[in-house]
């Protein structure tokens, strides 16, 4: 009876279990009743990082110097290239696909510490009573406007991204 499931590092094809190709190799042809799975090593600047049945290897990531990137770790047939940023620059994401001099703090966050040559901007959430409505690399959270000191009342509550809205007091007739 043909199998319905295969062991680890195998795959089911044409009602039979074939060996997967090991990391660093791609599939050339599936196994048959009489032959083993045929695999070929990935070419230069290519990789596959898992046991697989891929017919094409993945291209190594290109660390584009025009984006401020450089190679941190050269790729192998089993691993992708790891990029990092030029000295003094910071990756925009875990994958490090581009670089920024320093990151900015989004609305709702203020700058706790301005970036230096060695450390990136440190952001902090605006606490109650403070707001930031801009993306900035230097602005702190600003305190909500004090309506009372202007002889006004709060018409709309503030949030971490918006200031309070003040309005005239209702006069009792």
């Amino acid at each position: 009876e043909p199998p319905t499931a295969c062991r680890e590092k195998q795959y089911l094809i044409n009602s039979q279990c074939c060996s997967l190709c090991q990391p660093g190799q791609k599939l050339v042809s599936d196994c048959t009743e009489f032959t083993e799975t045929e695999c070929l090593p990935c070419g230069e600047s290519e990789f596959l990082d898992t046991w697989n049945r891929e017919t094409h290897c993945h291209q190594h990531k290109y660390c584009d110097p025009n984006l401020g990137l450089r190679v941190q770790q050269k790729g192998t047939s089993e691993t992708d290239t790891i990029c990092t940023c030029e000295e003094g620059w910071h990756c925009t994401s875990e994958a490090c696909e581009s670089c920024v001099l320093h990151r900015s703090c989004s609305p709702g966050f203020g700058v706790k510490q301005i970036a230096t040559g060695v450390s990136d901007t440190i952001c902090e959430p605006c606490p109650v009573g403070f707001f930031s409505n801009v993306s900035s690399a230097f602005e702190k959270c600003h305190p909500w406007t004090s309506c009372e000191t202007k002889d006004l009342v709060v018409q709309q509550a503030g949030t971490n991204k918006t200031d309070v809205v003040c309005g005239p007091q209702d006069r009792l007739r």
């Epitope: 025009n66 401020g68 030029e86 581009s98 920024v100 320093h102 690399a137 602005e139």
Partner: nanobody
């Protein structure tokens, strides 16, 4: 395409003044926080000064506080840096940069040399 063109650099005597300009194009200048950043020979990038989009709030590094003034003219899409009481340690290439400070959004810079 974002373009930032710095100008105004040159040789200045210690104690002298200089005004740098940065002409911006390819983006809506009035919407962006802008920075002046400098790089002294053989040193890393130093953040010098920043200004918010409206020109109402500014930041200065301790090393230039009281000597440098950042400003902007949103009608002319231009950023300025007025540098007074210049010192030898202000010698550097000065760059203007916009949020979010991506590597490709930089000008060529303008060299300021402070020397007698």
């Amino acid at each position: 395409e974002v373009q930032l063109l710095e100008s105004g650099g040159g040789l200045v005597q210690p104690g002298g003044s200089r005004r740098l300009s940065c002409a911006a194009s390819g983006f809506t200048f009035r919407d962006y926080e802008m920075w002046w950043v400098r790089q002294a020979p053989g040193k890393g990038l130093e953040r010098v000064s920043a200004i918010n989009p409206q020109g109402t709030r500014t930041y200065y590094a301790d090393s230039v506080k009281g000597r440098f003034t950042i400003s902007r003219d949103n009608s002319k899409n231009t950023l300025y840096l007025q540098m007074n009481s210049l010192r030898a340690e202000d010698t550097a290439v000065y760059y203007c940069a916009k949020l979010p400070f991506t590597f490709e959004d930089w000008g060529q810079g303008t060299l300021v040399t402070v020397s007698s």
